[in-house]
């Protein structure tokens, strides 16, 4: 190991204070006791250290805690957290939601970094599941957080946590993710009455199967076109013209503007033209009258 430079006379730090901003990097290394730093971490945030000085302070903590920092230090890292690598964070055991919040606050406004992703991963794994309080906290800081998880990770979300999810939290979710979240939402909201239930479940409907859409069509929900366009194509195709009309209510007129886009385009191709004509929207492309409709999916299943 390289021989360490001695601290100049009278420069030994008695406490972590603003006088340290005048210290050169080597002086900080030589004159600041790591244990003192650890006990006064909460003061560091108020002192305008340069990034280079912060590197020295981090190095001192790394030497003091080679197996990873204790939570008492982690909670007070402040902007020193921005200096941590994912490798550093993997050594931590963060159990307190307050610690998580403190570190996310430091990172507020920053892009979701590998450090933050690692921190969240460590925290959630430590808890065993993504509980409501954690999900509330994470989506408050990162609205897209839920949709950054894999379907496998989402499977650990308990239905009770779904109450914390806001519509904007699902904006970037793909169908595979909604397939996992929808049954949880259905379970979470099952005791609500019709209109209230629809308001809550609406954002999750991209994962709904045909039978649930059929059931909704009987409840005068008046689904808007934006929601309809996010439904699974395979769930929409079996719906009859009458069921779609009931499902959309007054919004049915919007089908005309979307007739070239999925799932509307594919749905039109499966309907009889005379059934489509009953809507009076001028939708074209249905099965001409007199044609026989074969269910090819049954044929594929047999072959």
């Amino acid at each position: 190991e390289v021989e360490k430079t001695a601290c100049p006379s009278g420069k030994k730090a008695r406490e972590i204070d603003e006088s340290l901003i005048f210290y050169k990097k080597w002086e900080l290394e030589a004159c600041v006791d790591a244990a003192l730093l650890a006990t006064q971490m909460d003061r560091v945030n108020a002192i305008p250290f340069t990034y280079e000085q912060l590197d020295v302070l981090k190095h001192k903590l790394d030497e003091l805690y080679p197996q990873g920092y204790p939570e008492s230090v982690i909670q007070h890292l402040g902007y020193l957290f921005l200096k941590m690598s994912p490798e550093d964070i993997r050594k931590w055991n963060v159990t307190s939601l307050e610690t998580l919040k403190a570190l996310l606050e430091v990172n507020k406004g920053h892009e979701m970094s590998p450090q933050v992703a690692t921190l969240i991963d460590r925290f959630v794994k430590g808890r065993g599941q993504l509980d409501k309080d954690t999900l509330d906290t994470l989506t408050a800081f990162y609205p897209g957080y839920l949709c950054s998880l894999s379907p496998e990770e989402l499977s650990s979300v308990p239905p009770s946590s779904i109450w914390a999810v806001r519509p904007q939290d699902l904006d970037t979710c793909d169908p595979r993710q909604l397939d996992v979240l929808y049954p949880k939402a259905r379970l979470a909201f099952q005791n609500m009455n019709g209109s209230e239930y629809f308001v809550k479940i609406q954002s999750f409907l991209g994962g709904a199967p045909t039978e649930d859409l059929k059931a909704l069509s009987q409840q005068n929900v008046s689904m808007d076109l934006a929601t309809f366009m996010k439904l699974r194509t395979d769930a929409v195709l079996p719906l009859t013209v009458a069921e779609v009309q009931k499902l959309l209510g007054p919004h049915v007129e919007g089908l005309k503007a979307e007739e070239r886009h999925r799932p509307v385009r594919d749905w039109i191709l499966r309907q009889r033209q005379d059934d489509l004509d009953t809507l009076g929207l001028g939708l074209q492309g249905g099965i001409p009258n007199g044609y026989l409709v074969l269910d090819l999916s049954m044929q594929e299943a047999l072959s």
């Epitope: 603003e18 901003i21 108020a46 002192i47 305008p48 250290f49 340069t50 990034y51 280079e52 912060l54 902007y79 921005l82 690598s85 507020k108 406004g109 920053h110 892009e111 970094s113 590998p114 450090q115």
Partner: antibody, heavy 117, light 107 residues
Framework: QVQLVESGGGLVKPGGSLRLSCAAS????????MTWIRQAPGKCLEWISY????????YYADSVKGRFTISRDNAKNSLYLQMNSLRAEDTAVYYC??????????WGQGTLVTVSS | DIQMTQSPSSVSASVGDRVTITCRAS??????LAWYQQKPGKAPKLLIY???VLQSGVPSRFSGSGSGTDFTLTISSLQPEDFATYYC?????????FGCGTKVEIK
């Protein structure tokens, strides 16, 4: 001595794109955080983005979030700002600066970006 | 965001005068404050950081003081090359923000 030289500015139509570059010399570029700051004609200075030495930590001001992307190439001693969906209000002199956390100690001479139809 | 308010917006002074510029933060920033000098057509130049630390190479006639929300830049004896616009800037939190400048003009 420390030198920062911006390039890539010019006239662009609203909705257009530009990529600014900042060539650094005279210091170990990979050791330092870097920042972009702009100054609209006759207006205040506005800090718009920074990137950590490794490139893993990034921040954007709300005014440019989702439109601008900061990046760096430590092997080339270069900092970049990719600007998309440009608006008239993005017209400014753009400066790159070395970021020391508590201050910006060296600045480039600036490059003018004009967004106009 | 933290707002930085400089006053006055301009000041007329003569060579040899003592000039004081103030900067107020909308919330406490301890000593996270820097001062810059900018001349027309040039990039800003760092004068002082951490409220009172003089940047290397900057003449000692420049000094900074203050803590919390109120800060001062003082030029003890104005020199011809000091006629410029001065900006304060906070680094206490993101986004970093600047004051809108104080122009020091020749009387």
């Amino acid at each position: 001595q420390v030198q920062l030289v911006e390039s890539g500015g010019g006239l662009v139509k609203p909705g257009g794109s530009l990529r600014l570059s900042c060539a650094a010399s005279g210091f170990t570029f990979s050791d330092y955080y870097m920042t972009w700051i702009r100054q609209a004609p006759g207006k205040c200075l506005e800090w718009i983005s920074y990137i950590s030495s490794s490139g893993s930590t990034i921040y954007y001001a709300d005014s440019v979030k989702g439109r601008f992307t900061i990046s760096r190439d430590n092997a080339k001693n270069s900092l970049y700002l990719q600007m998309n969906s440009l608006r008239a209000e993005d017209t400014a002199v753009y400066y790159c600066a070395r970021d020391r956390n508590s201050h910006f100690d060296y600045w480039g001479q600036g490059t003018l970006v004009t967004v106009s139809s | 965001d933290i707002q930085m308010t400089q006053s006055p917006s301009s000041v007329s002074a003569s060579v040899g005068d003592r000039v004081t510029i103030t900067c107020r933060a909308s919330q406490g920033i301890t000593r996270w404050l820097a001062w810059y000098q900018q001349k027309p057509g040039k990039a800003p130049k760092l004068l002082i950081y951490a409220a009172s630390v003089l940047q290397s190479g900057v003449p000692s006639r420049f000094s900074g003081s203050g803590s919390g929300t109120d800060f001062t830049l003082t030029i003890s004896s104005l020199q011809p090359e000091d006629f410029a616009t001065y900006y304060c800037q906070q680094s206490n939190s993101f986004p970093r923000t600047f004051g809108c400048g104080t122009k020091v003009e020749i009387k």
